[in-house]
């Protein structure tokens, strides 16, 4: 039975050219996290494997930095980075937990961070 929940940074916004941290946290479970995948729509951004560490996809290697923790830092943001991002926690024995973050990249300096919320 899957008892865990994923807490994410929720809906966030950032300025074009800036950077943003995508963060998820898995709680309320004793399951072992074997791997965390970060994806944008159907594109793989990065993987953090419990045994092998961080792996950044080739197409994002110049703009994505691992961390902090199991989070992901996106750099040199463009308007095209606007969209949904998913943290996918692969755990044993529970299975897979997925969290969603919506990022809006703004042209001007009106960007501000959204509230945190939970996805069961």
């Amino acid at each position: 039975m899957m008892t865990g929940t994923i807490e994410t940074t929720g809906n966030i916004s950032a300025e074009k050219g800036g950077s943003i941290i995508l963060q998820c946290h898995l709680s309320s479970t004793t399951a072992q996290v074997t791997q965390v995948n970060w994806e944008q729509q159907d594109q793989l951004l990065a993987i953090c494997n419990a045994d092998l560490g961080w792996h950044i996809s080739p197409s994002f290697k110049d703009r994505v930095a691992p961390g902090p923790g199991l989070g992901l830092t996106l750099q040199s943001l463009t308007v095209n980075d606007t969209g949904e991002y998913f943290c996918i926690y692969h755990t044993y024995p529970d299975g897979t937990y997925t969290g969603r973050i919506f990022l809006e990249v703004l042209e001007s300096s009106v960007a501000e961070h959204g509230a945190r919320f939970q996805i069961p």
Epitope: T34, Q35, L44, L45, A46, I47, N49, D51, L52, G53, H55, I56, S57, P58, S59, K61, H90, Y92
Partner: antibody, heavy 123, light 109 residues
Framework: QVQLQESGPGLVKPSQTLSLTCTAS??????????WGWIRQPPGKGLEWIGS???????YYNPSLKSRVTISVDTSKNQFSLKLSSVTAADTAVYYC???????????????WGQGTMVTVSS | EIVLTQSPGTLSLSPGERATLSCRAS???????LAWYQQKPGQAPRLLIY???SRATGIPDRFSGSGSGTDFTLTISRLEPEDFAVYYC??????????FGGGTKVEIK
């Protein structure tokens, strides 16, 4: 679909270094999801994993061979290579390169293989 | 390391018969990390099954995998002439390192 092809000397002298290269065609080894591995098979025996490498150069090795093994990658040539030092007759085997799905989790396996190349260690 | 013991070493059967191959691990293996391969003489191994029970692309449905923990099975429901080969199981953990079983030869009776 990626295809893999091993190349290198078929004969190596004892105490020397065995060097093999695997060239990928039909696809790039710059993949976010896959490592690229080496497996060997002595004549008439079973399979032994040697080690694997990610496009960025991250590696993981079989501990029993780690002290003698170096695996490297050259993304500009779409190749990865194996070096095995201080070889003996026991290293005589068919050497295969393969795509390693270790990051694919529920699909962990070697799903694409080269045809293999026979390497004999003899003086 | 995790030792995979395959049995029997050799299986003598006729075309059309059912083949049941066993792979036993020295310690528990996640079913997600268990694969089966077929190897014919002079050829590279070919992936048949990953995740203990999922068929790889292009593999006929007469091949099926099952099991969990320390006991895994590859079943060939009706042997075709091209199925006579050596079969290997493999576990794909990182720590302890990945290993292959010693193989089962399926030969024509």
């Amino acid at each position: 679909q990626v295809q893999l092809q091993e190349s290198g000397p078929g004969l190596v002298k004892p105490s020397q270094t065995l060097s093999l290269t695997c060239t990928a065609s039909g696809g790039s080894i710059e993949s976010g999801l896959y490592y690229w591995g080496w497996i060997r098979q002595p004549p008439g025996k079973g399979l032994e994993w040697i080690g694997s490498i990610y496009y960025s150069g991250s590696t993981y090795y079989n501990p029993s061979l780690k002290s003698r093994v170096t695996i490297s990658v050259d993304t500009s040539k779409n190749q990865f290579s194996l070096k095995l030092s201080s070889v003996t007759a026991a290293d005589t085997a068919v050497y295969y390169c393969a795509r390693d799905g270790v990051l694919a989790l529920n699909k962990r396996s070697f799903d694409i293989w080269g045809q293999g190349t026979m390497v004999t260690v003899s003086s | 390391e995790i030792v995979l013991t395959q049995s029997p070493g050799t299986l003598s059967l006729s075309p059309g018969e059912r083949a049941t191959l066993s792979c036993r691990a020295s310690q528990s293996v996640s079913s997600s990390y268990l694969a089966w391969y077929q190897q014919k003489p002079g050829q590279a191994p070919r992936l048949l099954i990953y995740g203990a029970s999922s068929r790889a692309t292009g593999i006929p449905d007469r091949f099926s995998g099952s099991g969990s923990g320390t006991d895994f099975t590859l079943t060939i429901s009706r042997l075709e002439p091209e199925d006579f080969a050596v079969y290997y199981c493999q576990q794909h953990t990182v720590r302890p390192p990945l290993t292959f079983g010693g193989g089962t030869k399926v030969e024509i009776k």
